[in-house]
Amino acid sequence: TQNKALPENIKYGIVLDAGSSHTSLYIYKWPAEKENDTGVVHQVEECRVKGPGISKYVQKVNEIGIYLTDCMERAREVIPRSQHQETPVYLGATAGMRLLRMESEELADRVLDVVERSLSNYPFDFQGARIITGQEEGAYGWITINYLLGKFSQKTRWFSIVPYETNNQETFGALDLGGASTQITFVPQNQTTESPDNALQFRLYGKDYNVYTHSFLCYGKDQALWQKLAKDIQVASNEILRDPCFHPGYKKVVNVSDLYKTPCTKRFEMTLPFQQFEIQGIGNYQQCHQSVLELFNTSYCPYSQCAFNGIFLPPLQGDFGAFSAFYFVMNFLNLTSEKVSQEKVTEMMKKFCSQPWEEIKTSYAGVKEKYLSEYCFSGTYILSLLLQGYHFTADSWEHIHFIGKIQGSDAGWTLGYMLNLTNMIPAEQPLSTPLSHSTYV
């Protein structure tokens, strides 16, 4: 049997990311003998559930079962039957459900209860569905990208396994943008924090990490747009909203009831003399940028330095991975290249936003109009958030890496969440064995 590989003992895990705009199911696998090693877990499948986020099913909870069926059945196909019963399934809900819980704890519990009952019907080892905190979302995103980048590995390599790896053990910061919230997480230079609420301490693989994190609820791209519309309609003279964040010639009717449905627009709510208004795009990046900046209150800061809305932010340090909607939007706009300067990004955004809507529709014929229409706003919002919100500069812009996947695994909180819940990130550095018994005999 010389040089014959023994069959590897493979383990699987499933995490459902119940986001504000949609739900995605991720399947991970790893060799059982190496589960305490760093970088051995990788994603084998992502299944995007058709439809909106679970919070939208609040009035139709009996449809949650069929909504989740296709992706759960896909997991049943991908994972060998012999492994089903020992495969853990976790569902984490993020800011969409945090917002629903703010409106009604009872309704949020009802949705989660039906989700739990639906997921319990499958042959996997269901471990529960819960709303994760913004702090957890930030922390697990940070763990995911650094795990995948090999930053927790004590073995120094003379080669680079991923494009962003600089061969040092300095961790990357994590920038996550969702539909309803955004997170910033990194290891600051100064280990003393002015704000204990934003401080996390980890011991991972024998090393201590003092991490800063904050999650800004209502500052995901979709909720930020609702906020901007609610703010701008306050000063509109009639039911026409001339909006610089949409392409010239774009028109869309918005129901005031939809606008005020979310808790994120409560601060702008007022009695309007109409039930609907029409957005008319004028496509002006500079004006859109100014409008977005009004969502960030920078006039008040009880600390040495703040992001916005009085939230402490230490000086930025090191490289950052920007993922989820940061990546999706910038990738659509073709602005993820390391070579594109911040000035160039701004120039491209000015050009993109000023393009007529009819022209845009022709250029991107395969893209759903609802999504297509919002890229001007989303791109402008990302620039505003990173530059004015988080204080990146033209110089530090080059430290932002827009990342979709690392080594085939999506950047996001789900992998870090599973690694934590399956105890696959040891506090101490595991003793390295010269050969694992799964190699060659």
Epitope: S20, S21, H22, K50, G51, P52, G53, K56, Y57, Q59, K60, E63, I66, Y67, T69, D70, E73, G96, G179, D222, V254, N255, D258, K368, K370
Partner: nanobody, 124 residues
Framework: QVQLQESGGGLVQTGRSLRLSCAAS????????MGWYRQAPGNERELVAA???????NYADSVKGRFTISRDNAKNTVYLQMNSLKPEDTAVYYC??????????????????WGQGTQVTVSS
């Protein structure tokens, strides 16, 4: 537009079986989900069984193990095989075809089509 036509309802005794059919016509390519709802007098309409475009199914707890939903894509027809019927299954059964919206505003469903309904009565 999609048109749905149910058939197969009727009066049966407890413990017997019925098979409902729902034939779809029109722009059925916009449809990913098909299912059966029922409404008993004085009650809300409730989802009984549903099937996805991939053929995966889901059932209300009250009918699990007794009812089976299936889909014949070639005939654009969805069926509900109802076995071991009980008096509490008495209701008007509606065929429904729909797809979910991907958006956080407006209605949950992007498309939503209903049949006229067929009466099922289970006598004891």
């Amino acid at each position: 537009q999609v048109q749905l036509q149910e058939s197969g309802g009727g009066l049966v005794q407890t413990g017997r079986s019925l098979r409902l059919s729902c034939a779809a016509s029109g722009d059925i390519f916009s449809i990913n989900y098909m299912g059966w709802y029922r409404q008993a007098p004085g009650n809300e309409r409730e989802l009984v069984a549903a099937i996805t475009g991939r053929g995966n199914t889901n059932y209300a707890d009250s009918v699990k193990g007794r009812f089976t939903i299936s889909r014949d894509n070639a005939k654009n027809t969805v069926y509900l095989q109802m076995n071991s019927l009980k008096p509490e299954d008495t209701a008007v059964y509606y065929c429904n075809a729909w797809d979910y919206s991907d958006y956080d505003e407006g209605p949950l469903r992007e498309y939503d089509y209903w049949g006229q309904g067929t009466q099922v009565t289970v006598s004891s």
